[in-house]
């Protein structure tokens, strides 16, 4: 099939889950071909590893694309440090890497 | 590890979720043992759209996955999406209410 | 931002359709699209929807007798075996409502 | 399929008066229905979704209501402008349930 871009979509930690102590950022790669993305993660423009874990889904059996999820996982104490959460993502789709962000404590 | 039931944690639809007219929403099934979990959306009524990802296995022994589904933006304020999670191994199921964050 | 359809023509009963949608001012890709259709002097009939990931659902009337599909510039409806009682106006419209094509009009006659 | 029942088919009200116009879903839609205005020869236009709310750019004496099965569009002040034909749609997504359109109901000056 032919090259498909990515959209792209980030979700906060719900509040439920900063009551427990944790942090799940999530970033959402949607129905995108071939199956090679990277995710980078940058929280206050720092980059961030070894705190993330991905998962790509089987390839689509009607359009052939796959998506794939980027978890960072942060304490909740290390969360509230920093404002700025960002994915940053690269694809053979994309003309340029897109980035996906938000500000903590905004809608 | 022992058998431990998920927590379910909403990923709710925003702004930064929301590309033209179509909206991503989705729960994050957290910290369970052992595999597997089956997650639904609507109780089987909501299967367009739907992407379940591989559980990840956590430095804790813990197993984690995210379900997501996309919709028509619009749709958003006007019905109801709910996540249907259920692991067995721990006897546990949970139906998730997902809505747009109120600021 | 709009909608054009086209396609529409004049067939003989049984002589396969289809009619295009097309998009200007935004990407197609990122909406759900639906396809309407009104007989001549009679009110609306939702045909079917087409999400994004290219799964259609249709008007129980509607299945077997039309098909949608998209790819990412366009949406098309297709008629495979169109009978008199398809003549109509056929739109295609943003599900959110807001956008709606000009319409293209089909005659179905021996 | 949610069935769309729409009431009454026509109705006639001098200028300055109030026209309301009942839409019945065949089970709960929740707030998913919108309400379109189509004047002859022209697409639908969007007035209303999500039931009660008003598009941008829509005069103010336009005002739907409801929720569930009972849905209601009221037009006060009624304008030679506002002659048209009105439809009701179902919005709520999901394939068991369809985009079914009300019958219409044709509005006329007195």
């Known amino acids: 099939r032919t090259v498909a871009a990515p959209s792209v979509f980030i979700f906060p930690p719900s509040d439920e889950q900063l009551k427990s102590g944790t942090a799940s950022v999530v970033c959402l790669l949607n129905n995108f071909y071939p199956r090679e993305a990277k995710v980078q993660w940058k929280v206050d423009n720092a980059l961030q590893s070894g705190n993330s874990q991905e998962s790509v889904t089987e390839q689509d059996s009607k359009d052939s694309t796959y998506s794939l999820s980027s978890t960072l996982t942060l304490s909740k104490a290390d969360y509230e440090k920093h404002k700025v959460y960002a994915c940053e993502v690269t694809h053979q789709g994309l003309s340029s890497p897109v980035t996906k962000s938000f500000n903590r404590g905004e809608c | 590890a022992s058998t431990k039931g998920p927590s379910v944690f909403p990923l709710a639809p925003s702004s930064k979720s929301t590309s033209g007219g179509t909206a991503a929403l989705g729960c994050l099934v957290k910290d369970y043992f052992p595999e597997p979990v089956t997650v639904s959306w609507n109780s089987g009524a909501l299967t367009s759209g739907v992407h379940t990802f591989p559980a990840v296995l956590q430095s804790s022994g813990l197993y984690s996955l995210s379900s997501v589904v996309t919709v028509p933006s619009s749709s958003l304020g006007t019905q109801t999406y709910i996540c249907n999670v259920n692991h067995k191994p721990s006897n546990t199921k949970v139906d998730k209410k997902v809505e747009p964050k109120s600021c | 931002q709009s909608l054009e359809e086209s396609g529409g023509r004049l067939v003989t009963p049984g002589t396969p359709l289809t009619l295009t949608c097309t998009a200007s001012?935004?990407?197609?890709?990122?909406?759900?699209m639906n396809w309407v259709r009104q007989a001549p002097g009679k009110g609306l009939e939702w045909i079917g929807t087409i999400t994004i990931d290219g799964t259609a659902y249709y008007a129980s009337w509607a299945k077997g007798r039309f098909t949608i599909s998209r790819t990412s510039t366009t949406v098309d409806l297709k008629a495979a075996s169109p009978t008199t009682e398809d003549t109509a106006t056929y739109f295609c419209?943003?599900?959110?409502?807001?956008?709606w094509g000009p319409g293209t009009l089909v005659t179905v006659s021996s | 399929d949610v069935v769309m029942t729409q009431t009454p088919a026509s109705v006639s009200e001098p200028v300055g008066g109030t026209v309301t116009i009942k839409c019945q879903a065949s089970?709960?839609?929740?707030?998913?229905l919108a309400w379109y205005q189509q004047k002859p020869g022209q697409p639908p236009k969007l007035l209303i979704h999500?039931?009660?709310i008003l598009e941008s750019g829509v005069p103010s004496r336009f005002k739907g209501s409801g929720s569930g099965t009972e849905f209601t569009l009221t037009i006060s002040d009624l304008e030679c402008a506002d002659v048209a034909t009105y439809y009701c749609?179902?919005?709520?997504?999901?394939?068991?349930?369809?985009?079914?359109f009300g019958g219409g109901t044709k509005v006329e000056i007195k």
């Open positions: 089970q709960s839609i929740s707030t998913a």
């Open positions: 999500g039931a009660s």
């Open positions: 749609q179902c919005t709520y997504y999901g394939i068991s349930y369809g985009n079914a």
């Open positions: 001012g935004f990407s197609l890709s990122t909406y759900y």
């Open positions: 419209a943003r599900y959110d409502g807001d956008i």
